[in-house]
């Protein structure tokens, strides 16, 4: 089960400093942006990060939107990356969820997060380099250290 | 570049075994979905089955359930389709494509050149 | 299953004229649909998205329309490379995906 908490904006970067951004296709990439860059491209930099208590505590159970014409939330339903045209919804009666992942920090780098799906445990978002572009995937972890399923989450409140 | 690259054109008779490969490259292929698709000659498209390498975890279309296998080699970045007794009826193009995340989600958006099956006594 | 069915089966139109294609779902599928190209001796190429969103490098004389059962591919002012056969696919209820028969683009 899990209770929607408080919410809060943020800008999430991979650890190429690159900024997580919905493009008008609905697709999300990471894109070389400064801070003021990825203030102008708001609302599709600005990610509603909410959180949920957890009636099996594993991490802080978050959803992560944005809302650019309308609120689409991240799902990874079939290990498939997709943001739903949906709010994120005030309660989940189940201890699994497509659209929740578990925040945790890296151990030794109180800065540095992971986010892991609720629905695959083991598998966690990452940047991942696809051609020129580095886009969201999921990504099962295979090695220890492993930097593309690491991310800065910095609060825009 | 992104690419599925399959394996050659095959001839067999009936009752013989085969696998088919398809490769893929250029992108972390044990993240991603490779469905299966046939196209018999002057036909359309039809699903077959899904495998996701990194877990070799796979889908079937009840069509093509028990009649073929999708495996793969998440080591060689790998998938397979294998019949263990050909039909005449089997003879077609069959083609792997990547199923997209993130970006096209649940679409073919990388397909493979396609692997020429024919099937005769 | 959901079955898709497309029509015209054979769409003959003229190079730089208006060319629309249709795809029906047995039932509704939202906006889970996508539009492939297939030209003689080459594997299909996704085309549209969504229903509606062009992939990377498709041309803005592509566009699609439509949601729940009702969809159309147009195609605004024909160039002679976009004669080939066009397929609708829903992704609705994946895995569980379906093409439509495909509809050929020729030249009149």
């Known amino acids: 089960y899990f209770g929607k908490l408080e919410s809060k904006l943020s800008v999430i970067r991979n650890l190429n400093d690159q900024v997580l951004f919905i493009d008008q296709g609905n697709r999300p990439l990471f894109e070389d942006m400064t801070d003021s860059d990825a203030r102008d491209n708001a609302p599709r930099t600005i990610f509603i990060i909410s959180m949920y208590k957890d009636s099996q505590p594993r991490g802080m159970a978050v959803t992560i939107s944005v809302k650019a014409e309308k609120i689409s939330t991240l799902s990874a339903e079939n290990k498939i990356i997709s943001f739903k045209e949906m709010n994120p919804p005030d309660n989940i009666k189940d201890t699994k969820s497509d659209i929740i992942f578990f925040q945790r920090s890296v151990p030794g780098h109180d800065n540095k997060m992971q986010f892991e799906s609720s629905s695959y445990e083991g598998y966690f978002l990452a940047a991942e380099k696809e051609r020129d572009l580095f886009k969201l995937i999921l990504k099962k972890e295979d090695e220890l250290g492993d930097r593309s399923i690491m991310f800065t989450v910095q609060n825009e409140d | 570049e992104v690419q599925l690259v399959q394996s050659g054109t095959e001839v067999k008779k009936p009752g013989e075994s085969l696998k088919i490969s398809c490769k893929g490259s250029?992108?972390?292929?044990?993240?991603?979905?490779i469905g299966w698709v046939r196209q018999m000659p002057g036909k359309g498209l039809e699903w077959m089955g899904f495998?996701?390498?990194?877990?070799?975890?796979?889908r079937y279309s009840p069509t093509f359930q028990g009649q073929v296998t999708i495996s793969a080699d998440k080591s060689f970045n790998t998938a397979f389709l294998q019949w263990s007794s050909l039909k005449a009826s089997d003879t077609a193009m069959y083609y792997c494509?990547?199923?997209?995340?993130?970006?096209?989600?649940?679409?073919?958006?990388?397909w493979g050149q396609g692997t020429m099956v024919t099937v005769s006594s | 299953e959901i079955v898709m069915t497309q029509s015209p089966a054979t769409l003959s139109v003229s190079p730089g004229e208006r060319a629309t294609l249709s795809c029906r779902a047995s039932e509704s599928i939202s906006s889970n649909l996508a539009w492939y190209q297939q030209k003689p001796g080459q594997a299909p190429r996704l085309f549209i998205y969504?229903?509606?969103t062009r992939a990377t490098d498709i041309p803005a004389r592509f566009s699609g329309s439509g949601s729940g059962t009702e969809f159309t591919l147009t195609i605004s002012s024909l160039q002679s490379e976009d004669f080939a056969v066009y397929y609708c696919?829903?992704?609705?209820?994946?895995?569980?995906?379906?093409f439509g028969q495909g509809t050929r683009l020729e030249i009149k």
């Open positions: 696919q829903q992704y609705n209820n994946w895995p569980s995906i379906t």
């Open positions: 495998i996701y390498p990194g877990d070799s975890e796979t």
């Open positions: 969504t229903a509606s």
């Open positions: 494509a990547r199923v997209g995340s993130g970006w096209y989600p649940y679409t073919f958006d990388i």
């Open positions: 250029g992108y972390t292929v044990t993240s991603y979905w």
